[in-house]
Amino acid sequence: QGGTRSPRCDCAGDFHKKIGLFCCRGCPAGHYLKAPCTEPCGNSTCLVCPQDTFLAWENHHNSECARCQACDEQASQVALENCSAVADTRCGCKPGWFVECQVSQCVSSSPFYCQPCLDCGALHRHTRLLCSRRDTDCGTCLPGFYEHGDGCVSCPTSTLGSCPERCAAVCGWRQMF
């Protein structure tokens, strides 16, 4: 008496489900359900998602489409792919910027902001890994520069300059007194 039995939809093709009073074919991706079918194994009335909305999958129950996300300009995000009826906007970072996740367990749907990539050249270092999903990985100092503290220092241009041991090894100079 509970009404827990859910009769199987015995229709040709497998994309049928009881909607309203009958088993109906669902709506394709990019369409929402306007009205259920009015005959067994019939077609539901489906309408295309309006502009700036989408539905990514075939569906039986969505009577409205999801609003497309807007990329967060405050977080320096840009649209890598515009929203369509079947797919949400894909937000990312413009060239020269990388994704910095705002949560520790980062997944594709996690909130993020865009950070400018390190310019290894400006730091007088080799670029070991180009910036894309994470920041640029800079390597050793460029020719004509040597490690000093956290940075790269230019080799002295004359014998008058001081050239510590690391400098001498890289620059080929001996300390002159």
Epitope: Q1, T4, R8, D10, C11, A35, T38, C41
Partner: antibody, heavy 120, light 111 residues
């Protein structure tokens, strides 16, 4: 035991309104599609409206725009709001439950009916 | 809308008789391997009672002397041996599409 009890019938003037109620018990009301069916004296049965368990409503052309079916699952109740009533709407109105084994409308339990008379 | 025509509109029969009622739809009510035709019994002053669904399936609790057959547009309800409690009016109903419609009824009276 499944029970459907209609109420709200009576005498109403042409152009008037009436709201019928159906109190359901003995089953999980929210899981079932429900219908209203009417029968004029000495005549056959006529389907008037249906409300599916997932929230959709259906009407024949003869009452569309004049009648509104609704349900309140928390109260195990089905309603029929009838506006712009005509003499031709005079009938006994039955509340009926659709069978849960069916993915098509067939009615396995009926109430005893409530009489609606439209007359001046 | 699908029109449902029942015949005869009334009949007189005796206890023990075999009774056949027919229902003709204005278009086929069969699709996807099923015939969406159902039969109800109604006694005076009472609510209808479901007897047969999908043309030939006996509703739970209904005596086996009731049977249904047919497909497409022509359907039959048969009572193999009429009992005193079977004197009533019988209606067919389709659910092939909306709106749902019923036949005009067949009244089975005592001869």
């Amino acid at each position: 035991e499944v029970q459907l009890v209609e109420s709200g019938g009576g005498l109403v003037q042409p152009g008037g309104s009436l709201r019928l109620s159906c109190a359901a018990s003995g089953f999980t009301f929210s899981n079932y599609d429900m219908s209203w069916v009417r029968q004029a004296t000495g005549k056959g049965l006529e389907w008037v409206a249906a409300f599916s368990s997932d929230g959709y409503t259906f009407y024949p052309g003869s009452v569309k725009g004049r009648f509104t079916i609704s349900r309140e699952n928390a109260k195990n109740s089905l309603y029929l709001q009838m506006n712009s009533l005509r003499a031709g709407d005079t009938a006994v109105y039955y509340c009926a439950r659709h069978a849960d084994y069916a993915n098509y409308p067939v009615m396995d339990y009926w109430g005893q009916g409530t009489l609606v008379t439209v007359s001046s | 809308d699908i029109q449902m025509t029942q015949s005869p509109s009334s009949l007189s029969a005796s206890v023990g008789d075999r009774v056949t009622i027919t229902c003709r739809a204005s278009k086929s009510v069969s699709t996807s391997g099923y015939s969406y035709m159902h039969w109800y019994q109604q006694k005076p002053g009472k609510a209808p009672k479901l007897l047969i669904y999908l043309a030939s399936n006996l509703e739970s609790g209904v005596p086996s002397r009731f049977s249904g057959s047919g497909s497409g547009t022509d359907f039959t309800l048969t009572i193999s041996s009429l009992q005193p409690e079977d004197f009533a009016t019988y209606y067919c109903q389709h659910s092939r599409e909306l709106p749902l419609t019923f036949g005009g009824g067949t009244k089975v009276e005592i001869k």
